[in-house]
């Protein structure tokens, strides 16, 4: 079956900026701003649009020690990107894959909101309980906040 | 354990050029953000800037821009704050720290270098 | 830039003491504030990091709170030893001015 999962986090940072960082350069930042929870992200093939395989390998913090993901879809007008996580012991023996799709709106007040859809696909008729999805929501908003506070502190960056 | 060594107490005249050091061990070097801090006699910390070991990814804050120079060399584990022409207003500790708490706080520094400029 | 703003600059307690200490950023910075204690002679010591979490190590006596722009350092009971400057950071920037707690 397919287990749905959304999450909704704010941040100050202006929706085009966030986007920029976040996403667009996130391979090279956020080792950089979160080394405990990301070590590295490399291309093992593409150029970073849509088809390009990346190997994500996890830092000292994290309970697991790498994934592989598909990037699907990156669209830089409406600040979307769409990736899948197709192989790493983050799957475990429950999931055959995870599709994320990650988008950045403007939020009313100033700053942005990250919004992150994501389908859980079970091998056979695994349950997945929103306990086991809740991991994913974790990192992106500990990534997110990681990228957030570089970029406060360094205004002349990815406008 | 991690631990930053830095190099010596200087003493140097106006117009001089002077590089110290950092030594860092015990952990990933390439990984971490270190920074540099300057501390001038009986007055509080300033933020110098920052450098990331893996490929020299270097920020300056703007009042330090142009007056020092911060480089790294990974294979051996240092980091480097250099001055081309000292002023006697240099005169200062100067504290390198490594930037390994979440969210970018300095979790482990190093004892700091006494750098003296008088003519 | 953003500046952050610490007070009061000095204060003097007694052992046993309540000491509270507060910094104001010129513009939010969400909770990306740090906490360090000096002694004279002495590197700085990371004491909280994103404005409430004790770094490993430091005694449960200090706290922090806040979010946005204004931010607490409290030490619940001082001790000899807590007697220093200490300083707030803006993670990845600049420094407070520092407050020197002192003996009264």
């Known amino acids: 079956g397919v287990f749905n999962y959304e999450v909704e986090t704010p941040s100050v940072i202006p929706a085009a900026r966030l986007f920029k960082s976040y996403v667009l350069d996130g391979d090279k930042l956020i080792p950089k701003v979160a080394p405990q929870a990301i070590t590295s992200v490399e291309n093992v093939e593409g150029n970073g649009g849509p088809g390009t395989i990346k190997n994500i390998t996890f830092g000292e913090g994290s309970r697991y020690k790498y994934v592989k993901e598909r990037v699907d879809e990156v669209d830089n007008t409406n600040f979307t990107y769409s990736y899948t996580v197709i192989e790493g012991d983050v799957l475990g023996d429950k999931l055959e894959k995870v599709c994320h799709e990650l988008k950045i709106v403007a939020a009313p007040g100033g700053g942005s909101i990250l919004k992150i859809s994501s389908k859980f696909h079970a091998k056979g008729d695994h349950e997945i309980n929103a306990e086991e999805m809740k991991g994913a929501k974790e990192m992106a908003e500990k990534l997110l906040r990681a990228v957030e506070t570089y970029l406060l502190a360094h205004s002349a960056e990815y406008n | 354990e991690v631990q930053l060594v830095q190099s010596g107490a200087e003493v140097k005249k106006p117009g001089e050029s002077l590089n110290i050091s950092c030594n860092g061990s015990g952990y990933n070097f390439t990984k971490y953000w270190i920074a540099w801090v300057r501390q001038m006699p009986g007055k509080g910390l300033e933020w110098m800037g920052i450098i990331y070991p893996g490929d020299s990814d270097t920020k300056y804050r703007p009042s330090f821009q142009g007056q020092v120079t911060i480089s790294a060399d990974k294979s051996i584990t240092t980091a480097y704050l250099q001055w081309s022409r000292l002023k006697v207003s240099d005169t200062a500790i100067y504290y390198c720290?490594?930037?390994?708490?979440?969210?970018?706080?300095?979790?482990?520094w190093g004892q700091g270098t006494l750098v003296t400029v008088s003519s | 830039d953003i500046q952050m703003t610490q007070s009061p600059s000095s204060l003097s307690a007694s052992v046993g003491d309540r000491v509270t200490i507060t910094c104001q950023a010129s513009q939010s910075i969400v909770n990306y504030l740090n906490w360090y204690q000096q002694k004279p002679g002495k590197a700085p010591k990371l004491l909280i990091y994103a404005a409430s979490s004790l770094q490993s190590g430091v005694p449960s006596r200090f706290s922090g709170s806040g979010s946005g722009t204004d931010f607490t350092l409290t030490i619940s009971s001082l001790q000899p030893e807590d007697f220093a400057t200490y300083y707030c950071q803006q993670s990845y920037a600049a420094f407070g001015e520092g407050t020197k707690v002192e003996i009264t």
């Open positions: 720290a490594r930037l390994g708490a979440t969210y970018g706080g300095a979790d482990y």
